[in-house]
Interface confidence: medium
Amino acid sequence: SLQDLCSNCPAGTFCDNNRSQICSPCPPNSFSSAGGQRTCDICRQCKGVFKTRKECSSTSNAECDCISGYHCLGAECSMCEQDCKQGQELTKKGCKDCCFGTFNDQKRGICRPWTNCSLDGKSVLVNGTKERDVVCGPSPADLSPGASSATPPAPAREPGHSPQ
């Protein structure tokens, strides 16, 4: 049967009902990654903020990456998102510095609150910055007399918090 004949068509070809030769090679800029296909898929084009990581072949789709200053998001790099600097987060208005009490040590993602050392019964050994979390040290009881323990405030922009 026609179905049986189509199953013989290998990857890189499609089952062409309009031609006596049942298996036809995929046209330029298209591919079929499995056998028995009735059509070839159009190759993905890596344009704009996308750059080609792997060229399309008759048996596999092109793979895209992001140009410098952007990073991939989503399955198979379906989106490119702008990089920010450490100590910033990407908002709908672009990159913005982390609010006091929060940090981001990467070029992507959002600012996160500093660790609250006191919740673990510890003290702040090294203060946090926009780029780095606080470093928690020994518990206050382990410190020599006169040592102080600082607890960072809640992040200024955590929903529901109202810095004065």
Epitope: M79, K92, K93, I110, R157, P159, Q164
Partner: antibody, heavy 118, light 108 residues
Framework: EVQLLESGGGLVQPGGSLRLSCAAS????????MSWVRQAPGKGLEWVSD????????DYADSVKGRFTISRDNSKNTLYLQMNSLRAEDTAVYYC???????????WGQGTLVTVSS | EIVLTQSPGTLSLSPGERATLSCRAS???????LAWYQQKPGQAPRLLIY???SRATGIPDRFSGSGSGTDFTLTISRLEPEDFAVYYC?????????FGQGTKVEIK
């Protein structure tokens, strides 16, 4: 306690103008982005415009671009929306909201009703 | 423009039941930028969930959010009488900021 109080709504004829105000208290107004969001009677929410803490960066929905202007006076802790060339489809309750950018809108005013009708 | 489509339009349930609300984006949205709101008649919306899964201050733990990419879910584990309202999802990932059309949770 964070409070946002809108005023300036009312009945206006098509083509007319109106200026909405939003008085903010209970937080450092000058540190936050602010937005206007509207809701037509019986309908869903529609973002209208936003402004950054200094007032230098503004953005608008396509439906109001060129007709509405958002502004703020940090010395008065007040947000404004100047609405010109009003249309029937601008009829809605207008809310001002504190805009946390990444995190959405965490505080909203009670809203002020704008009715555009002849 | 990122279009957010909520389903179902209306959910008829009884107090004590579990409510599952869906929000589907027309393109991928980083989960950090997805929020959920509750609105009762005559009131302003109230922020429930930000960052797709973090509860806002004062929100009971029966409310939870999940999802990533294009599919997000708000779950109310056991409906209380005060939970019957309209719920909206919203993205602040890119301009224009957009809301879903809302899901009404009504008493069966």
């Amino acid at each position: 306690e964070v409070q946002l109080l809108e005023s300036g709504g009312g009945l206006v004829q098509p083509g007319g103008s109106l200026r909405l105000s939003c008085a903010a208290s209970g937080f450092t107004f000058s540190s936050y982005d602010m937005s206007w969001v509207r809701q037509a009677p019986g309908k869903g929410l529609e973002w209208v415009s936003d402004i950054d803490p200094t007032g230098s960066k503004t953005d608008y929905a396509d439906s109001v671009k060129g007709r509405f202007t958002i502004s703020r006076d940090n010395s008065k802790n007040t947000l404004y929306l100047q609405m010109n060339s009003l249309r029937a489809e601008d009829t809605a309750v207008y809310y001002c909201a504190r805009d946390l950018m990444v995190y959405g809108f965490d505080y909203w005013g009670q809203g002020t009703l704008v009715t555009v009708s002849s | 423009e990122i279009v957010l489509t909520q389903s179902p339009g209306t959910l008829s349930l009884s107090p004590g039941e579990r409510a599952t609300l869906s929000c589907r984006a027309s393109q991928s949205v980083s989960s950090s930028y997805l929020a959920w709101y509750q609105q009762k008649p005559g009131q302003a919306p109230r922020l429930l969930i930000y960052g797709a899964s973090s509860r806002a201050t004062g929100i009971p733990d029966r409310f939870s959010g999940s999802g990533s990419g294009t599919d997000f879910t708000l779950t109310i584990s056991r409906l209380e009488p005060e939970d019957f309202a309209v719920y909206y999802c919203q993205q602040s990932y890119s301009y224009p900021v957009t809301f879903g059309q809302g899901t009404k949770v009504e008493i069966k």
